[in-house]
């Protein structure tokens, strides 16, 4: 049955060290505010649909995006924002402000990350909204545009 | 005794795969240099107290603290830095410069992060100074100003 | 042999959680574009070596690096830019475009930071070049710029 | 309560050597970074050199008027830290304290408020 | 290496005067410096670390601030006691220095 008390190799299997993890990076066309993933990534004891991470076991995640931008600076300034879902829910959001001189430049780069730790159980979803979606840089820096998960601890 | 050599489920929840953590997001109403959490975040292993996160296990953490800041920009630049410390004593920094065309405009967002990985005893003290800390952006984004560590390992 | 199926603290002290980690801070002297980093930091299951991290044991790997910058500004913007580099290729960068007002100003702080999630084979060299090397803080901010690894799992 | 205790000190000629001895006492001396301090004759405190616990891979550093010529070393299982003193000049003449090192505060929660009384040396022909 | 550099090099001052030494790094040190209290013939003492931070048992009367470049410890109200040299020390990076130390005398 599920009880495995004397059996070690299938204790040592079990909980405290049990892993499991994301690495994605961002699809090559995006088209709405909810970024879509490259399902080829790493995966392991994770899965993926539809711009989601599904998580499969429950347990403390490590959750960490990171988004590499190239902005055609209009006259104005741009507030470059992401967001980080649980299920839907923006738990999580990273703002920065750039073009702020005003000035029509060739073009700005800016980085952004954000991370989360969280206790996630099975079937929740793990996405990423960015309102700007236009200036992430999929061409010249598509490797640069990851989000990334780790069971950090599925012990109580 | 403290040996358990003989006892599976003793050796299994010793030393390799002991967890601490801690996840707190920074309190509503700052008003000194050295920032205070809301004590209602995730704590197991770890005490909060007076503004400092107090380690319970020794060991090797990884820690990280992401602020949120929205500045309202005067005729000048702006630097903002974010302190890390350990038992009082800057461990690590991050600087960037805000609002660096001297205009003042409406408003500049800016979200800055910081990491360290270090030998933490038992009693350790953990926490945050910011010089700026009337620009924490503790209103509108509440959830993103926050404090983390946790456990990596705590063997030798 | 190599088999330990009956030694109980043989196999705690196998696999799935082995543990290697790295935390190496910049040289104070750079002179070129693949940083160095001074080799007394924290160094366990990793070597270091001519400006690379050499992995000792084969797993997924946690990488993270973060620069602390001081840019003097001149007429025009400057990008800064961080690369990761896996066995002299690279995996991962960050950019982020400062003094883009094109005003000669003092001084400019911007902090940059990148991660990674990878697999690594033992002898893999891990490194960070940086062809705004010169504007790297290491003077006023020598603790700021640092390289740092763990491995998070060792099996597959 | 924590103790530092020195010994080894005494007259030597210049050239010669010496080696300094300081047994520690009320602290987990394994975990604990350690510093000798020097005194000169009517002056103030030198910085001669440190050495980190094995955690942190157990290095040295020193002070550039002894760099080549004096060795720290430790021995966890004895509780004790040693200062090998060669090529002694006359300007090493001071009483040399042996204390726990400031980094301990930030590693380990104990700060460098623990002094020995210290043992005198002195070069002279 | 860090300089560090201390003032006065002798004071003297009345009981329960307000006494304060200065010490200046030649580069900044965050706050990692030391205050320490040493009297002839006597173990040395901690009284400050962390550049504010009162070591457990020394008097409220001492306290240090600064960070950088300029630190400061204060005696608010001096005592016979107190009569002794004051050295600060860097313990930001290696040589960790010493200042060249501040004699206090009652007048």
């Known amino acids: 049955g599920g009880n495995c008390s004397e059996d070690l190799l299938c204790i040592l299997k079990r909980a405290p060290f049990k892993k499991s993890w994301a690495y994605l990076q961002v699809a090559k066309h995006l088209n709405k505010t909810k970024l879509s993933w490259n399902k080829d990534g790493i995966l392991h004891g994770v899965r993926y649909q539809d711009g989601n991470l599904v998580i499969q076991f429950p347990g403390l995640y490590f959750i960490i995006c990171q988004l590499q931008f190239l902005v055609q600076c209009p006259n104005n300034s741009v507030d470059l924002k992401l967001e980080l879902l649980i299920n839907k829910h923006i738990k999580k959001q990273a703002l920065v402000t750039v073009c702020e001189s005003g000035m029509q430049t060739k073009h700005v780069y800016q980085n952004l990350s954000q991370f989360l730790l969280d206790y996630l159980q099975v079937n929740t979803t793990v996405s990423v909204n960015v309102d700007t979606f236009q200036y992430i840089d999929t061409s010249t820096f598509p490797l640069e545009n990851v989000l990334s998960v780790f069971l950090y601890s599925n012990s109580d | 005794g403290g040996n358990c050599s003989e006892d599976l489920l003793c050796i299994l929840k010793r030393a390799p795969f002991k967890k601490s953590w801690a996840y707190l997001q920074v309190a509503k109403h700052l008003n000194k240099t050295k920032l205070s959490w809301n004590k209602d975040g995730i704590l197991h292993g770890v005490r909060y107290q007076d503004g400092n996160l107090v380690i319970q296990f020794p060991g090797l953490y990884f820690i990280i603290c992401q602020l949120q800041f929205l500045v309202q920009c005067p005729n000048n630049s702006v630097d903002l830095k974010l302190e890390l410390l350990i038992n009082k004593h800057i461990k690590k920094q991050a600087l960037v410069t805000v609002c660096e065309s001297g205009m003042q405009t409406k408003h500049v967002y800016q979200n800055l992060s910081q990491f360290l990985l270090d030998y933490l005893q038992v009693n350790t003290t953990v926490s945050v100074n910011v010089d700026t800390f009337q620009y924490i952006d503790t209103s509108t984004f509440p959830l993103e100003n926050v404090l983390s560590v946790f456990l990596y390992s705590n063997s030798d | 042999g190599g088999n330990c199926s009956e030694d109980l603290l043989c196999i705690l002290k196998r696999a799935p959680f082995k543990k290697s980690w790295a935390y190496l801070q910049v040289a104070k002297h750079l002179n070129k574009t693949k940083l160095s980093w001074n080799k007394d930091g924290i160094l366990h299951g990793v070597r270091y070596q001519d400006g690379n991290l050499v992995i000792q044991f084969p797993g997924l790997y946690f990488i993270i690096c973060q620069l602390q910058f001081l840019v003097q500004c001149p007429n025009n913007s400057v990008d800064l830019k961080l690369e990761l580099l896996i066995n002299k290729h690279i995996k991962k960068q960050a950019l982020v475009t400062v003094c883009e007002s094109g005003m000669q100003t003092k001084h400019v702080y911007q902090n940059l930071s990148q991660f990674l999630l990878d697999y690594l084979q033992v002898n893999t060299t891990v490194s960070v070049n940086v062809d705004t090397f010169q504007y790297i803080d290491t003077s006023t901010f020598p603790l700021e710029n640092v390289l740092s690894v763990f491995l998070y799992s060792n099996s597959d | 309560e924590v103790q530092l205790v020195e010994s080894g000190g005494g007259l030597v000629q210049p050239g010669g050597s010496l080696r300094l001895s300081c047994a520690v006492s009320?602290?987990?001396?394994?975990?604990?970074?350690m510093s000798w301090v020097r005194q000169a004759p009517g002056k103030g405190l030198e910085w001669v050199g440190r050495i980190k616990s094995k955690t942190y891979g157990g290095t040295t550093d020193y002070a550039a008027p002894v760099k080549g010529r004096f060795i720290i070393s430790r021995d966890d299982s004895k509780d004790t830290l040693y200062l090998q003193m060669n090529s002694l000049k006359t300007e090493d003449t001071a009483i040399y304290y042996c204390?726990?090192?400031?980094?301990?505060?930030?590693?380990?929660?104990?700060?460098?408020?623990?002094w020995g009384k210290g043992t005198t040396v002195t070069v002279s022909s | 290496d860090i300089q560090m550099t201390q003032s006065p090099s002798s004071l003297s001052a009345s009981v329960g005067d307000r006494v304060t030494i200065t010490c200046r790094a030649s580069q900044d040190i965050r706050n990692y410096l030391a205050w320490y209290q040493q009297k002839p013939g006597k173990i040395t003492h901690l009284l400050v670390y962390?550049?504010?931070t009162l070591q457990s048992g020394v008097p409220s009367r001492f306290s240090g601030s600064g960070s950088g470049t300029d630190f400061t410890l204060t005696i608010n109200s001096l005592q016979p006691e107190d009569v002794a040299t004051y050295y600060c020390q860097n313990y930001f990076s290696v040589p960790l220095t010493f200042g060249g130390g501040t004699k206090v005398e009652i007048k």
């Open positions: 009320g602290i987990t001396f394994s975990n604990a970074w």
């Open positions: 204390t726990t090192d400031p980094w301990n505060y930030v590693n380990y929660n104990y700060f460098m408020d623990v």
């Open positions: 962390a550049a504010s």
